[in-house]
Interface confidence: low
Amino acid sequence: GILNLNKMVKQVTGKMPILSYWPYGCHCGLGGRGQPKDATDWCCQTHDCCYDHLKTQGCSIYKDYYRYNFSQGNIHCSDKGSWCEQQLCACDKEVAFCLKRNLDTYQKRLRFYWRPHCRGQTPGC
């Protein structure tokens, strides 16, 4: 769920998601369209695709709450939950570490980017 994602991103990146990533660029936060603006935005576009795939499998991506552990800088998704919960955790883990990998190219100007100006082809999943 969204609470899981927020907590995980904060733990991995050290940034408050509400202040730094939701929204950011053309794909971070709810919805997304157009060409991603940078590597951080690509992380979110890929994450959107991950969620879209789970939706087609009938997973309730915003309501499903999964269990995980964060220790020594790594995320360990619990194998005790449902398939949907485990996959959701995997999607969120991937985006959290993707955002961390790209902290050095994070652009403050893309925070609250003007979505109507997100142009170009939206990448396929």
Partner: antibody, heavy 113, light 107 residues
Framework: QVQLKESGPGLVQPSQTLSLTCTVS????????MQWVRQPPGKGLEWMGA???????QYNSILKSRLSISRDTSKSQVFLKMNSLQTEDTAIYFC???????WGQGVMVTVSS | DIQMTQSPASLSASLGETVTIECLAS??????LAWYQQKPGKSPQLLIY???SLQDGVPSRFSGSESGTQYSLEINSLQSEDAVTYFC?????????FGSGTKLEIK
């Protein structure tokens, strides 16, 4: 093309409730956030609140206790309700598409007995 | 709340001149600033977004820049139709706030 139009009463009695409608065309409310802004005669602009594309609502804390924003996506309409009106609420009320790339023409609301 | 201090409140310039309007944010707004033009009896029109990006259809004589928390709108080759009111606005966080406005007049 994109169009926004506000409608509502031009005159409201003090202590009464103001109800305004913003009717949009050329885009879907489920894809764009919508804002309400007001401007007292000869003065500056004040942001009142917004309803996000996902349905979440945010209010200016100064007005929060008196304000209600809602929408009907099937009718492409956004609504503003504000109660306990006083003469200082006299203003032109605008709806605008987030982030203010399109505005309605505004509706003048006078609070007077 | 983030305060936007706009200056000057009014200014007068001659046709063809360059004028600058400034807005000072009370804290870092990370380029999340827009400029609007408002003609009498009309709704505001977006000129500049993200501090320096020109909105579609806006003449290139309008430009925006920033330095720290100070944001500027520059109008080059002033024309008679530019003699209206200009507002800045941050969209960093809620509540969004506007500057108090600058009324531009032609000498």
């Amino acid at each position: 093309q994109v169009q926004l139009k506000e409608s509502g009463p031009g005159l409201v009695q003090p202590s009464q409730t103001l109800s305004l409608t913003c009717t949009v065309s050329g885009f879907a409310l489920t894809s764009y956030d919508m804002q309400w802004v007001r401007q007292p005669p000869g003065k500056g602009l004040e942001w009142m609140g917004a309803i996000w594309a996902n349905g979440n609502i945010q209010y200016n804390s100064i007005l929060k206790s008196r304000l209600s924003i809602s929408r009907d996506t099937s009718k492409s309409q956004v609504f503003l309700k504000m109660n306990s009106l006083q003469t200082e609420d006299t203003a032109i009320y605008f709806c605008a598409r987030f982030r203010f790339d399109y505005w309605g023409q505004g509706v003048m609301v006078t609070v007077s007995s | 709340d983030i305060q936007m201090t706009q200056s000057p409140a009014s200014l007068s310039a001659s046709l063809g001149e360059t004028v600058t309007i400034e807005c000072l944010a009370s804290e870092d707004i990370y380029s999340n600033l827009a400029w609007y033009q408002q003609k009498p009896g009309k709704s505001p029109q977006l000129l500049i977004y993200d501090a320096s990006s020109l909105q579609d259809g806006v003449p290139s004589r309008f430009s925006g820049s920033e330095s720290g928390t100070q944001y500027s709108l520059e109008i080059n080759s002033l024309q008679s139709e530019d003699a209206v009111t200009y507002f800045c606005q941050h969209h960093r966080d809620s509540p969004l706030t506007f500057g108090s406005g600058t009324k531009l007049e032609i000498k």
